[in-house]
Interface confidence: medium
């Protein structure tokens, strides 16, 4: 599985790892594997999200490469919270198949954190 | 300016190759996909293959899937089509245009085919 | 992809408008309809007017326009004028592969 490292309190993207068809107008959706269960990131519908390759005013799509990461998933001011793996799927429109792919995410460098800080919220850009 | 300029073209026998070159300039020609069209005499456009920005993922029509391959080399700034096993009915203007809407077309290259 | 009329005699100064209509929906399952508009001047590369139905591209006049839904699209131009004779075509981007109306041959009556 591939890895990506960040320094802490740095905005990262993370790559869709998924073997996408250029030509397919998939949707993304990210979830975080946690220990029992999954955790899905916010991933509002808007045209960055969509594989069909538009780039209209900095709207990002998988066959052009948005910030060279297509279907990137954008965790901004990253903590300790941050780090583990993390699955992107993309969903075929025509329903006949999805395609996943997984990376793990390292954040270092960061200071020990009080029990009640809460995870961070996600937002795929 | 933003601009694609194309080469390559020729009158070729039926069974022989070509290759179609589209340079790139203006623009950050790495971060975009690139695709071919072809427009035969007096008939309307036809998508032809497609390649993702990194030249990792390619994508063709059905009428040229294995005779046709598209590429790209980026530090060149130049998109290719390698025409194979050519046929008389893939005389067209060849375009090369910009990522998946479209947004910008070369000024188009003429591909005879013609024994 | 099916466009209507194929040729389109026009007045210049007079409206015009071109149909195009999908055998599928082209609403995506993100909420956008990737339906384009291209013109083709006489001799000259096609160049892109409207994109996801209704959005001009830059330096379009703004007598274009485009509006529909699911299946059923429209290019408008309020009124015509001698730069705007030749073939339109529509193209959808919501499935794959990609695909184009037949074209449409705008001429001076």
């Known amino acids: 599985t591939p890895e990506v490292k960040v320094a802490c309190s740095e905005d990262v993207d993370l790559p869709c790892t998924a073997p996408w068809d250029p030509q397919v107008p998939y949707t993304v959706s990210w979830v975080k594997l946690l220990e029992g269960g999954e955790e899905r990131m916010e991933t509002p519908q808007e045209d960055h999200l969509r594989g069909q390759h538009y780039h209209q005013k900095g709207q990002n799509g998988s066959f052009d490469a948005p910030n060279e990461r297509p279907y990137s998933l954008k965790i901004r001011n990253t903590t300790s919270c941050n780090s583990g793996t993390y699955r992107c799927t993309l969903q075929d429109p025509d329903g006949q198949r999805n395609l996943s792919g997984k990376v793990i995410l390292r954040v270092t460098g960061c200071p020990a954190q009080r029990k009640e800080e809460t995870f961070k919220k996600y937002r795929a850009e | 300016e933003v601009q694609l300029v194309q080469s390559g073209g020729a009158v070729v026998q039926p069974g022989r190759s070509l290759r179609l070159s589209c340079a790139a300039s203006?623009?950050?020609?790495?971060?975009?996909?690139m695709h071919w069209v072809r427009q035969a005499p007096g008939k309307g456009l036809e998508w032809v293959a497609a390649?993702?920005?990194?030249?990792?993922?390619?994508y063709y029509a059905d009428f040229v899937k294995g005779r046709f391959t598209i590429s790209r080399d980026n530090p060149k700034n130049t998109l290719y089509l390698q025409m194979n096993s050519l046929r008389a009915d893939d005389t067209a203007v060849y375009y090369c245009?910009?990522?998946?809407?479209?947004?910008?077309w070369g000024q188009g290259t003429t591909v005879t085919v013609s024994s | 992809m099916t466009q209507s009329p194929l040729s389109l005699p026009v007045t210049l100064g007079q409206p015009a408008s071109i149909s195009c209509r999908s055998s599928q929906s082209l609403i995506h399952s993100d909420g956008n309809t990737y339906l384009d508009w291209f013109q083709q001047r006489p001799g000259q590369s096609p160049r892109r007017l409207i994109y996801k139905v209704s959005n001009r591209d830059s330096g379009v006049p703004d007598r274009f326009s485009g509006s529909g839904s699911g299946t059923d699209f429209t290019l408008r131009i309020s009124r015509v004028e001698a730069e705007d004779i030749g073939v339109y075509y529509c193209?959808?981007?919501?499935?794959?592969?990609?695909?184009f109306g037949q074209g449409t041959k705008v001429e001076i009556k």
């Open positions: 203006g623009f950050t020609f790495s971060t975009y996909g």
């Open positions: 390649v993702s920005y990194d030249g990792s993922n390619k």
């Open positions: 193209m959808q981007a919501t499935h794959w592969p990609r695909t």
């Open positions: 245009a910009r990522r998946g809407g479209l947004d910008i």
